[in-house]
């Protein structure tokens, strides 16, 4: 029951988190005009990952997309990539976790398969959350750097060189949405990984021990002689002894961090 709750909660938290990551990625307020020196301005500037906007006092808002790809800063491109990777991984994770939910029965899917899927989705959520947090943090760092660098800027207009104070930008709402959403996705992923450990079927009155034969990598189960490949655990992760025999969980190949780069 606790496992089902943990898994369900992990799914819901991750779902909210991924929705937040998508929202943050689409939002225009990644950076907003710093109003420290001029708290009441008739023209307010703000920027997102995809376009920059200007809101006038009149209520008229004009947004212009970044139609160039090569002309954009590498950091902005990196942030876009991180957020998109986060969304894609999160979406795949959600899809996998739906089928992994204990409360949903799909054909004759074994608990071992559900455990694997739960773990996979959990790892995907963790990586997704980390991508979002990294993306937002890189952008925030970029803002801080630019904030102190922006003093005065020169623009060439129709009237020649014009001295104009460069608009300084500070953290926008999207950054906070992104940080929170990334954190939620990360927490949801951890919960899914925790739920995975308890998803395996209850232990029987005997221990399932894998005997590694010299010729073939086949695990023999006493009391049924059911062959298995050793992938996809059926029992709880308990060490019996440190000799040649080990539980099936320990033979399981977990995805390494390089699988998701």
């Amino acid at each position: 029951m606790a496992v089902t709750a943990c898994q369900g909660l992990g799914f819901v938290v991750s779902l909210i988190g991924i929705a937040g990551i998508i929202a943050a990625t689409c939002m225009d307020q990644w950076s907003t005009q710093d109003l420290y020196n001029n708290p009441v301005t008739a023209v307010f500037n703000y920027q997102g990952l995809w376009r920059s906007c200007v809101r006038e006092s009149s209520g008229f808002t004009e947004c212009r997309g970044y139609f160039t790809l090569l002309g954009l800063p590498a950091m902005l491109q990196a942030v876009r990539a991180l957020m998109i990777v986060g969304i894609v991984l999160g979406a795949i994770g959600l899809l996998v976790s739906i089928f992994a939910l204990k409360c949903i029965r799909i054909g004759s899917m074994e608990d071992s398969a559900k455990a694997n899927m739960t773990l996979t989705s959990g790892i995907m959520f963790i990586v997704s959350g980390l991508c979002a947090i990294a993306g937002v943090s890189v952008f925030a760092n970029m803002l801080v750097t630019n904030f102190w660098m922006s003093t005065a800027n020169m623009y060439t207009g129709m009237g020649g060189m014009v001295q104009t104070v460069q608009t300084r930008y500070t953290f926008g709402a999207a950054l906070f949405v992104g940080w929170v959403a990334g954190g939620l996705t990360l927490i949801g992923g951890v919960m899914m990984c925790i739920a995975c450990r308890g998803l395996a079927p209850e232990e029987t009155n005997y221990k399932a021990v894998s005997y590694h034969a010299s010729g073939h990598s086949v695990a023999y189960k006493p009391g049924g002689f059911k062959a298995s490949t050793g992938f996809g655990s059926n029992t709880k992760n308990k060490k019996i002894y440190d000799g040649g025999a080990r539980t099936e969980d320990e033979v399981q190949s977990y995805p390494s961090k390089h699988d998701y780069v």
Epitope: A42, V43, Y46, S52, V54, S58, G59, R64, G157, Q166
Partner: antibody
Framework: QVQLVQSGAEVKKPGASVKVSCKAS????????INWVRQATGQGLEWIGE????????YYSEKFRGRVTLTADTSISTAYMELSSLRSEDTAVYYC???????????WDQGTTVTVSS | DIVMTQSPSSLAVSLGEMATINCKSS????????????LTWYQQKPGQPPKLLIY???TRESGVPDRFSGSGSGTDFTLTISSLQAEDVAVYYC?????????FGQGTKLERK
Amino acid sequence: QVQLVQSGAEVKKPGASVKVSCKASGYTFTSYVINWVRQATGQGLEWIGEIHPRGGNTYYSEKFRGRVTLTADTSISTAYMELSSLRSEDTAVYYCAILRRGNAMDYWDQGTTVTVSS
Amino acid sequence: DIVMTQSPSSLAVSLGEMATINCKSSQSLLNSGNQRNYLTWYQQKPGQPPKLLIYWASTRESGVPDRFSGSGSGTDFTLTISSLQAEDVAVYYCQNSYNYPYTFGQGTKLERK
């Protein structure tokens, strides 16, 4: 068609207050910001302040801060400008205007003449 | 506050001739966010309220004849009437639309020679 109609001319004594109304029609009242500008006889234009009817946010010129109050009644699509502690130099034509794209004052009413005389 | 200075204060031009009015602001009116200059031009005839001519320094308001044009960027702006018509005799004002308080130039009185 957008129309702004102001209240009639006012004659006030120094120290008194005046409340000028500006009734809007032909558009959704809360959609546009209303600005108030005054013009003394033979003088230039002077911005008083603006009100955002949707939220009631107001911005005032420092010169008038504390003496002017801008309000809006969305139920009757009317904006008000109240100027207190009137002085003779407040004698002017008071205009209300709609702020549009580019923060430009697009539609103006015919103005209300306020005369401050003892 | 942004100070708007217009020159000349009065101008006499023959009908059909070009009229040029200048406006200088104490601070740049160029917004870096959209690269637009927040300067507005108005025309006011005696006994009438001002009429919007040009916003964003060079964008003509709908219904304004194309003989009126605005140019300039940053702090220096110009209103040009390519061929003066009798109905163009009026007072012209430039206005800072960029920052509060919105400030107007003192006006340029355009007369026919």
